[in-house]
Amino acid sequence: AGVFELQIHSFGPGPGPGAPRSPCSARLPCRLFFRVCLKPGLSEEAAESPCALGAALSARGPVYTEQPGAPAPDLPLPDGLLQVPFRDAWPGTFSFIIETWREELGDQIGGPAWSLLARVAGRRRLAAGGPWARDIQRAGAWELRFSYRARCEPPAVGTACTRLCRPRSAPSRCGPGLRPCAPLEDECEAPLVCRAGCSPEHGFCEQPGECRCLEGWTGPLCTVPVSTSSCLSPRGPSSATTGCLVPGPGPCDGNPCANGGSCSETPRSFECTCPRGFYGLRCEVSGVTCADGPCFNGGLCVGGADPDSAYICHCPPGFQGSNCEKRVDRCSLQPCRNGGLCLDLGHALRCRCRAGFAGPRCEHDLDDCAGRACANGGTCVEGGGAHRCSCALGFGGRDCRERADPCAARPCAHGGRCYAHFSGLVCACAPGYMGARCEFPVHPDGASALPAAPPGLRPGDPQRYL
């Protein structure tokens, strides 16, 4: 368990031409709030698909009223972090959607009106417990700057928050089989808390609250021997009473799965795949009806009104197995053409096409500029499977529809003066600076023979030395 934390640093006009109009006005003051939606894995799901990892809504920001004639500044933000708690393991790879919403506070009938200002999305890799990661995302002419991290809630630790830590019982070492809990070396890795009553000798768990039996034992708490021999568990821990550890058969030898179930080995024990009408660790439980809800992943249960008649699960797309328990990897058939990326969304298969290709399976080769109109005298320029508009003087944006003030975003660093020019903008740099936007000091330090700065260390703002 843990918490994903999102800190919004700024939301305002992005750099470059085409500064957006302020979302608020003197007549319609407004305030911002943000919504974050998290999904596991690197899937690029539709914005409206469920936020399986969780979602959060920020508080409302301060009320903002546009100053007439002033360019849209960075807008005032809500206080605090957006926090998305997650109950299970942190997946390591995740997709996010961050939405910026505007709440208008004018004289609307029926209270405030909400409208979506911008939506950014992305896919990232992130280890829990790491430092804040910074990001910049652009949505149209808006720019969102934010940081995020995932942290574990005690006693969970690790990059996936799956290891548990407890204070050491003895000062010098951890218990048998338990490692020190880096980076908390004064704590020890704790065993998972299994289902209450689960046999410590014959049961184990890979998830909190479960009880899985070692070979030779059964029952909900793994206290019932399958046979009278006390040495049926050659690969598990030795029996507490006999200390018996006889090298013996593998966990699937003799097929421990009853009622026609098929056995497969797992790292710790075995797993039975049961035929219809049976379930349990060894397929020993029968008489399942639809009332027991045996179909997983949204499968539809048919028949099985009484224990003597079998039920059938009709599985939704993307799942198979007698209980719809297995996910089908439909991407293994490589259905996407022309190097498209296959995304199995469960309910549908989607191809994310490379630039220059389109169609459900990326089968259509696009003429980049076909049907693309650039407004206000702009011309379409093809290249790399994408199109862009080369805009006439005074216009900008993807389709040259936005009136451009290239200096609105204050693009010149270190006190450089910005001038609008027919080719865009020109920065007139202060003495001692170079670069298209004056971002490079010619001599960044005043003293000679400065020692090398360690990585990431800032010797200081170059302006101080000139």
């Epitope: 640093h9 750099p15 990232r124 990661a133 910074r134 990001d135 910049i136 700057r145 660093a413 670069g435 298209a436 936007r437 971002e439 490079f440 000091p441 960044p444 990431g456 800032r458 010797p459 703002d461 170059p462």
Partner: nanobody
Framework: EVQLVESGGGLVQPGGSLTLSCAAS????????MAWYRQAPGKKRELVAG???????VYVDSVKGRFTISRDNAKNSVYLQMNSLRAEDTAVYYC???????????WGQGTLVTVSS
């Protein structure tokens, strides 16, 4: 925080070539302006070449036509291709990043380039 790690320095003969690489830890490297600086013993650190976030480049006169700066945003890296090296190019070469989010400069630790026969 932007971490910068340079590599590729070493000993080369006059007239030889060398390529320096700088890897940035920043997740949005396309929004960094990056540059190479150098500092010879007993001298001030000076700009060699820079590449803005829009891809435009700048060079000091002493390296124009010999050095080329380039970037690969997909690899979070910036490169300095140095040809026709001279003894006076001997210095510690530093990677520099100007992060537009907070208008902050960041520096790498440096890599030594020695031009000598």
């Amino acid at each position: 925080e932007v971490q910068l790690v340079e590599s590729g320095g070493g000993l080369v003969q006059p007239g030889g070539s060398l390529t320096l690489s700088c890897a940035a830890s920043f997740s949005a490297v396309a929004y960094l302006s990056m540059a190479w600086y150098r500092q010879a013993p007993g001298k001030k650190r000076e700009l060699v070449a820079g590449i803005s976030d829009d891809g435009s480049t700048v060079y000091v006169d002493s390296v124009k036509g010999r050095f080329t700066i380039s970037r690969d945003n997909a690899k979070n890296s910036v490169y300095l291709q140095m040809n026709s090296l001279r003894a006076e190019d001997t210095a510690v070469y530093y990677c520099y990043a100007y992060e537009w989010t907070n208008a902050l400069p960041y520096w790498g630790q440096g890599t030594l380039v020695t031009v000598s026969s």
